[in-house]
């Protein structure tokens, strides 16, 4: 009797889609999997025969419930299927977005990328998939642990007003109202603000 | 029963243009996104590009960028390929598809409806 594939999971970020799983313990060799997905009421094959522990799922619809299934075989022996289901649009999770930050004076200027979608055309992005995208900002100086949020209107945001020659850390992710969701959040990026701009009477 | 048609293909010489068209019958073009897909002799379906209907917004493949533009004309349910500077690489059976989500643009998975296609030879 062939165990089945353990720990089956849907891995998805930004719709790169993978189906991973661990191979179970068995003592007569070596494993391979295959993993399928049901389509019109019909498994096709995705990943066949496979010594690989994941499959790329990238190019399923995002729309929709999606039946899933991974088993092991050995020889002329295989496992009974693992299931899962997966709705790409409701389960990927949202990626960290990108973030161009340039100091001006006593002013951070804050410029926001969405996420880059697998299988898509570059300039398709999570904003296009997401009606509702939006950016969530938190800033704070560096050294203390208050943090300021904000939610920008728009791909850019300028915070004004900072405190002269002092660093001040920002990270952004991506925020979607209408499901309450709210994705990675970007890695710290920490600049140091020059003199400020008024002038003294 | 939505029914996409293509028109406008044909044989044209390279560096030539063509502008295919993708009229809705049956229902409005009322979709959130329209797709142009080709399949060139012998390979798989590819994406060209597509046009959100939300924002208006396009999208294109980086073997046709600054050729060809998408477009569409609402009051004739109809969306426009404009192909120029074109190449014998183009030559192919090109496709438009109907997206009832508009989630996607470049996967054939993401689109519902799809019309039966249009020829288009480029070739001196």
């Known amino acids: 009797m062939v165990p089945p594939p353990e720990n089956v999971r849907m891995n998805s970020v930004n719709f790169k889609n993978i189906l991973q799983w661990e191979s179970p313990a068995f003592a007569k060799g070596n494993l391979t999997f295959t993993a399928q997905y049901l389509s019109y009421r019909i498994f096709q094959d995705k990943c066949m025969n496979t010594t690989l522990t994941e499959c790329d799922f990238s190019s399923l619809s995002k729309y929709g419930d999606h039946t899933l299934r991974v088993r092991a075989e050995f020889a002329d022996e295989h496992s009974d299927w693992v299931n899962i289901t997966f709705c790409p649009v409701d389960d990927t999770i949202i990626g960290p977005p990108g973030m161009q930050v340039e100091v001006l004076a006593d002013s951070l200027h804050m410029r926001f990328l969405a996420p880059k979608i697998e299988n898509e055309y570059e300039t398709w992005t999570m904003k296009n998939v997401y009606n509702s995208w939006t950016y969530n900002v938190q800033y704070w100086k560096n050294g203390t642990d208050e943090k300021f949020q904000i939610t920008p209107q728009y791909d850019f945001e300028v915070l004004r007003n900072l405190e002269p020659w002092t660093t001040y850390c920002v990270q952004v992710r991506g925020f979607l109202p209408d499901r309450n969701k709210a994705g990675e959040w970007s890695e710290p990026v920490c600049e140091q603000t020059t003199h400020d701009e008024t002038v003294p009477s | 029963e939505v029914q996409l048609v293509e028109s406008g293909g044909g044989l044209v010489q390279p560096g030539g243009s063509l502008r295919l068209s993708c009229a809705a019958s049956?229902?409005?073009?009322?979709?959130?996104?329209i797709g142009w897909f080709r399949q060139a002799p012998g390979k798989g379906l590819e994406g060209v590009s597509c046009i959100s209907a939300s924002e208006g917004s396009t999208h294109y493949a980086d073997a046709v960028k600054g050729r060809f533009t998408i477009s569409r004309d609402n009051s004739k349910n109809t969306v426009y390929l404009q192909m120029n500077s074109l190449r014998a690489e183009d030559t192919a059976v090109y496709y438009c598809?109907?997206?009832?989500?508009?989630?996607?643009?470049?996967?054939?998975?993401?689109?519902?409806?799809w019309g039966q296609g249009t020829m288009v030879t480029v070739s001196s």
């Open positions: 598809a109907a997206s009832l989500h508009g989630l996607g643009c470049k996967s054939e998975a993401d689109y519902d409806y």
């Open positions: 049956g229902n409005s073009l009322d979709y959130p996104t």
